[in-house]
Each structure stands twice: as C-alpha cells, then as structure tokens.
C-alpha cells in the first residue's frame, strides 16, 4: 500500500520552523496557522483504495515505517 512521505523536511529546502501543537505549516504562505484553517483530510469511506494522509506536516517527529513503506506526515504541525 502506497503511503505519503515522512514529513516536510526538505530535500531542496530547509525544514520550516516547527509549529506549536494544534498548528500546521501552510506551504503557500510559509508559516504556521491553526490546523482548523486548513482543509485537513477526512476519513475515507470503507473500501477506499488507499489510506488518507495524516493531518499535518511535522518535520521534527517521526515514527517507524514498515519495510518498503514511508511513514506519513504526522498530525499536529509542520
């Protein structure tokens, strides 16, 4: 099952300033905003073909991923 990349930590850009909890990094304005202001993903209907991405981009935390599978961005912030 394909999954999203681990975080927004950059290959070609520096990691953004970490957001405080309940804030998310908005790539278009390049600063942290309340997560509720961004159209974060909803759970998909049963039987959907792939998992919904987590809610936010968060460079400073990570969780382990299974073999051949990258972890998704974590909830909270970028």
């Amino acid at each position: 099952m394909r999954r999203g990349p681990r975080s927004l930590r950059g290959r070609d850009a520096p990691a953004p300033t970490p957001c405080v909890p309940a804030e998310c990094f908005d790539l278009l304005v390049r600063h942290c905003v309340a997560c509720g202001l961004l159209r974060t993903p909803r759970p998909k209907p049963a039987g959907a073909s792939s998992p919904a991405p987590r809610t936010a981009l968060q460079p400073q935390e990570s969780v382990g991923a299974g073999a051949g599978e990258a972890a998704l961005p974590l909830p909270g912030l970028l």
Partner: antibody, heavy 118, light 111 residues
Framework: QVQLQESGPGLVKPSQTLSLTCTVS????????WNWIRQHPGKGLEYIGY???????YYNPSLKSRVTISRDTSKNQFSLKLSSVTAADTAVYYC????????????WGQGTLVTVSS | DIVMTQSPSSLSASVGDRVTITCRAS??????????MNWFQQKPGKAPKLLIY???NLGSGVPSRFSGSGSGTDFTLTISSLQPEDFATYYC?????????FGQGTKVEIK
C-alpha cells in the same frame, strides 16, 4: 462529502465582465483554499487563482490585471470576476479545492462553459 | 512558473495493455521531503478526477492498477492493465508553488 457547484451566465459579450460563483457544501470556505481553473475548448487546464481561508487571494500573473476572486462566507460561496473579456476567454470554468498537506485538488465542481461572443 | 511537459501527447493502446505516461518539470517539485506532483484523469464533458497525489499516493476510490512514481523533475503514471473505462486524457500537475501548472495532457485512445 464536499461538493462544489459553479453558476453564472453562459454567454458574455466581448469587453464585458465574466462573473461566476461557486457554491460549496459539506465544508466551510473559511477553511482551506478555494480555486478557479479554466479549460479552453479542446485544450489543457489553466490555473486562475485562489481565495484562502483568511480571504487572501492569489492570481496567476498571466491574468492578474483582469481577475478578482472574492467570497461571501454567509452563503459559503466564492466568486470569480474576469474583466474585459475576449473570445480567448471562452472556456469551461471550474472551481476546485485542494487537500492538505499535499495541495492536490481532490474536489472539483462539474464546470460551466462560458462563451464570449457578441 | 514551473513548466510541465508530458509525453506522449497521445497514444493508442488495447484493453489489458500496460500504459506509461511521463511528465517532466522545468525545476524540482520536491520540497520538505514531498514530491508535489499530482495526476488527473479527465473524460469528455467531465471535470478532472484526482488519480495520484504526492507522486505516488492513490486518490480516493482510484483502482490499484494506477500507480505513480518519480521525484525531483521526472515522474511517471502507469496503468498496469488498461480497462475500457481508462480511455481518457491524463494530466500531470505540480502543487509545489503557485501558479499551479499542468502538463498539456496525454490522450489515451483505443487501438
């Protein structure tokens, strides 16, 4: 389920202003980014611009001098105005909204054809 | 603006064929470890439908025969076994920076 529906005149005269509205259900336009895209007949997709959760706007530089995007949060609608239209503005106009954090447009209106002709 | 170039512009294929469409960006669309590359399917008279986001993630309800790969500037959309409902036009699009830009499209026709 988020749904978007475009509405507005299907025929506009040259030099006049094209006005379209996108009505959103299933989500609030005070969250996320709300976009306009157009497609000329038989051609590819062209990005017009957005209005954001805060009401800030971005317009494609190729159209910036003629475009205004606004919103009415009480009706959960956002609108496109394109001034001084010519036949080259004849297109199907779509409203769409991207997901977060990937900014991929996963919700689209069905599109509305606007013809510019006298 | 980031220019997206798709190839081929059209192709003819048969049901069951493996189909590959490529897209090249004029500059990297990677940022913060994400490839901001998306693929859409469009059928005549219909709005585009999101197939793949962030280079390799399936959109909601998209069959697993569709897959995406790539990073940086070079990306691929693959249909592992073409089905009758897959005859359509496919567009790549970058969402790294505005103005968001699209490829010119690849029309997949019946051979």
């Amino acid at each position: 389920q988020v749904q978007l529906q475009e509405s507005g005149p299907g025929l506009v005269k040259p030099s006049q202003t094209l006005s379209l509205t996108c009505t959103v259900s299933g989500d609030s336009i005070t969250s996320g980014y709300w976009n306009w895209i157009r497609q000329h007949p038989g051609k590819g997709l062209e990005y017009i611009g957005y209005i954001s959760y805060s009401g800030s706007t971005y317009y494609n530089p190729s159209l910036k001098s003629r475009v205004t995007i606004s919103r009415d949060t009480s009706k959960n609608q956002f609108s496109l105005k394109l001034s001084s239209v010519t036949a080259a503005d004849t297109a199907v106009y779509y409203c769409a909204s991207p997901n977060y954090p990937f900014y991929a447009m996963d919700y689209w209106g069905q599109g509305t054809l606007v013809t510019v002709s006298s | 603006d980031i220019v997206m170039t798709q190839s081929p512009s059209s192709l003819s294929a048969s049901v069951g064929d493996r189909v590959t469409i490529t897209c090249r960006a004029s500059e990297s669309v990677d940022n913060y470890g994400i490839s901001f590359m998306n693929w859409f399917q469009q059928k005549p008279g219909k709005a585009p439908k999101l197939l793949i986001y962030a280079a390799s993630n399936l959109g909601s309800g998209v069959p697993s025969r569709f897959s995406g790969s790539g990073s940086g500037t070079d990306f691929t959309l693959t249909i592992s076994s073409l089905q009758p409902e897959d005859f359509a036009t496919y567009y790549c699009q970058q969402s790294k920076e505005v103005p968001w830009t699209f490829g010119q499209g690849t029309k997949v026709e019946i051979k």
